[in-house]
């Protein structure tokens, strides 16, 4: 897999998608996990909801969202009030039973200043251009975040 | 404060159609869908439908489709359900429910009292 | 759908008593991701119901540690160690697991 690199500025919200093939996960539910290390373990941040067909519903863990449209085949994981800590390795997954199929590696990265990165077509059109090695940049100034995994998210 | 605050009594006729409305307030409304559902003498509590706030796709009990259809009003913060073809099985009280993710129904509205009548 | 049965339909304690229901499914409510979403909401007298219990023995925010849920699988339990006056109500089972939610026909609660 190639490594997507999708930029947000601190404070702000991020907003990571994920396409896949919507047959070839039919009736999957799908998660996005943090990469602990190089050869680590993908540690669960949150999943979508447990009923497939409630899929298209945002279920939170923290300020980390995460929506699936399961007919057009796109993930979409939104990572609010984006944080320095929050930089690092991800992954959207496919479930199906104990494994799971990795359908994108991610890289965040997280802008200190805005300013730093004027170029307004990536600031206010979300697109890919190539970087180095295998990995391809997306900027993106959307919406949302990652706190620690927690169980059960507060009530409001 | 989270708050869902529900439109009041209803009292139609047979074959009319009623559009009962749920604002949500103390919380980012786009964050969380907004479920539907019947209580009624006869069958209790039932299920009939959620709607995303965030992108607007539904969700219906088989049971429902074609009898309900929910709608949602991001700038207003409030979620709207339609009921058609309303006849007495239809009497009953709707409530809204915030879903949670994890397990929906943490806030409900106060319901809406629907009464059909000739 | 899943058939969710409560039991009894009316119990009559009297304060400081303990009190129990039954909930029972017609399916297996042990979800693939190894939860359990076997909720229960109580219904005071003229209001709308709120949130109790989730996933089988969670307790809401707010509600005393008198309340206890357990079971698996099918059958689940809400007991309530001492009840109170306030206790009073209709307490209804649901389940999250399968497609569509259902919920038990309630139980209501009267204090003798």
């Known amino acids: 897999h190639n490594t997507t690199v999708f930029q947000g500025v601190a404070g702000q919200s991020l907003q990571v998608s994920c396409p896949y093939d919507s047959m070839k996960h039919w009736g999957r539910r799908k998660a996005w996990c943090r990469q602990l290390g190089e050869k680590g373990p993908c540690q669960r941040v949150v999943s979508t909801h447990n009923l497939w067909l409630l899929s298209f519903l945002r279920r939170w863990n923290g300020s980390t969202a995460i929506t699936d449209d399961t007919l057009g085949g796109t993930l979409t994981i939104t990572l609010r009030n984006l944080q320095p800590h929050d930089a690092g390795l991800y992954q959207c997954q496919s479930l199906h039973g104990s494994e799971a199929d990795t359908l994108r590696k991610v890289l965040v990265e997280v802008l200190a200043d805005p300013l730093d990165h004027r170029d307004a077509g990536d600031l206010w059109f979300p697109g890919e251009s190539e970087s180095f090695e295998d990995a391809h940049v997306e900027h993106s100034i959307s919406r949302s975040l990652l706190e620690g995994e927690i169980p059960f998210p507060p009530t409001s | 404060q989270v708050h869902l605050q529900q439109s009041g009594p209803e009292v139609v006729r047979p074959g009319v159609s009623v559009k009962i409305s749920c604002k949500g307030s103390g919380y980012t409304f786009t964050d969380y869908g907004m479920h539907w559902v019947k209580q009624s003498h006869a069958k209790s509590l039932e299920w009939i439908g959620v709607?995303?706030?965030?992108?607007?796709?539904?969700s219906y009990n088989q049971k429902y489709k074609g009898k309900a259809t929910v709608t949602v009003d991001k700038p207003s913060s409030t979620a709207y359900m339609e009921l058609v073809r309303l006849t007495s099985e239809d009497s009953a009280i709707y409530y809204c429910?915030?879903?949670?993710?994890?397990?929906?129904?943490?806030?409900w509205g106060q319901g809406t009292t629907l009464t059909v009548s000739s | 759908d899943v058939v969710m049965t409560q039991t009894p339909l009316t119990l009559s304690v009297t304060i400081g008593q303990p009190a129990s229901i039954s909930c029972k499914s017609s399916?297996?409510?042990?979800?693939?991701?190894?939860?359990?979403?076997l909720n229960w909401l109580l219904q005071r007298p003229g209001q709308s119901p709120k949130r109790l219990i989730y996933l089988v023995s969670y307790l809401d925010s707010g509600v005393p540690d008198r309340f206890t849920g357990s079971g698996s699988g099918t059958d689940f339990t809400l007991k309530i160690s001492r009840v109170e006056a306030d206790d009073l109500g209709v307490y209804y089972c649901?389940?999250?697991?399968?497609?569509?939610?259902?919920f038990g026909g309630g139980t209501k609660l009267e204090i003798k």
């Open positions: 649901w389940q999250g697991t399968h497609f569509p939610y259902t």
């Open positions: 399916q297996s409510l042990l979800d693939s991701d190894g939860k359990t979403y």
């Open positions: 709607i995303s706030t965030y992108n607007g796709n539904t």
């Open positions: 429910a915030r879903d949670f993710g994890y397990v929906p129904f943490d806030y």
